[in-house]
């Protein structure tokens, strides 16, 4: 079964720069699985933002604008990040990563 | 059937204003973030504002900033474009795009030209 | 931001034969952020191709995408009377939101 491991604890920037997150991938091949990522904001329900699948499609959140949240992997690290554009304040939260395994 | 009927084009004099409206059906307007994109006379495609379904992420392009303000209605299922101290180089086709999940603009308005005169 | 340039800027083809356009991205950008847009005269734009291997409902499987990193192609295997029309790449992974110059397909 597969495992994620997101090592940042925190991540502090400035407003209106970039935050990277990762989530590392184990026990199972990355390219052969779909990654979601999530927020939780303080006091709200968690919120679905982005996946890339197995293929490298991306889906994301609707009432998102593109090119707010970006996702990826990386095979070779067997790592997905998550790339939040143009931080603000509502930005602020906890990011989770998950994995459906194909 | 998803529709995006403009409205509000026209001709504007430089240093003017003018509000573009964008009527959505077919779909939970509520739910999705919408653009508005222009193309200049024989000109390509350019990408001037975005803003989320809930209106609390709004985007615009840099040759727009602190002129232009995008807004929506969902109550109305309407986006809007409010164009202020409007220049030569704003002269175009305005089209309102809707943003799917799979982040292209999916549906787009018919297109509704504004013409700046000085 | 990101800057995508197109080429050719005109392409002179005829009905049958095989269209190869161009779209270099300035920055390396993921393939799952790339799109692909056709315009005809006096009509709104229409997606294609998004990402690396979508294709638009009703979108015929002549029309393919591929490419990574800086290069991507657009490749129209035969060309049918209705595809002479200008087509747009489109970055939408990050803010803002960038389009090609375009390339015209017309007839030879």
């Known amino acids: 079964a597969g495992h994620l491991e997101q090592p940042q604890i925190s991540s502090t920037k400035t407003l209106s720069k970039t935050a990277r997150l990762e989530c590392v991938v184990s026990g199972i091949t990355i390219s052969a699985t779909s990654v979601y990522w999530y927020r939780e904001r303080p006091g709200e329900v968690i919120q679905f933002l982005v996946s890339i699948s197995y293929d490298g499609t991306v889906r994301k959140e609707s009432g998102i604008p593109s090119g707010k949240f970006e996702v990826d992997r990386i095979p070779e690290t067997s790592t997905s990040t998550l790339t939040i554009h143009n931080v603000e304040k509502q930005d602020i939260a906890t990011y989770y990563c998950a994995l459906w395994e194909v | 059937e998803v529709q995006l009927v403009q409205s509000g084009g026209g001709l504007v004099k430089s240093g003017g204003s003018l509000r573009l409206s964008c009527a959505a059906s077919g779909f939970t307007f509520s739910t999705y973030s919408m653009n508005w994109v222009r193309q200049a006379p024989g000109k390509g495609l350019e990408w001037v504002s975005s803003i989320s379904s809930s209106s609390s992420y709004i985007f615009y392009a840099d040759s727009v900033k602190g002129r232009i303000i995008i807004s929506r209605d969902n109550a109305k299922n309407s986006l809007y474009l409010q164009m202020n101290s409007v220049r030569a180089d704003d002269t175009a086709v305005y089209y309102c795009?809707?943003?799917?999940?799979?982040?292209?603009?999916?549906?787009w308005g018919q297109g509704t030209l504004v013409t700046v005169s000085s | 931001e990101i800057v995508l340039t197109q080429s050719p800027g005109t392409l002179s083809l005829s009905a049958g034969e095989r269209a190869t356009l161009s779209c270099r991205a300035s920055?390396?950008?993921?393939?799952?952020?790339l799109a692909w847009y056709q315009q005809k005269p006096g009509q709104a734009p229409r997606v294609l191709i998004y990402g690396p291997s979508g294709r638009a409902t009703g979108i015929p499987d002549r029309f393919r995408g591929s490419g990574s990193g800086t290069d991507f192609t657009l490749t129209i295997s035969r060309l049918e009377p209705e595809d002479f029309a200008v087509y747009y790449c489109q970055q939408f992974g990050r803010s803002p939101l960038t389009f090609g110059g375009g390339t015209k397909v017309e007839i030879k």
């Open positions: 920055q390396s950008i993921s393939s799952s952020y």
């Open positions: 795009a809707k943003d799917g999940e799979l982040g292209v603009f999916d549906y």
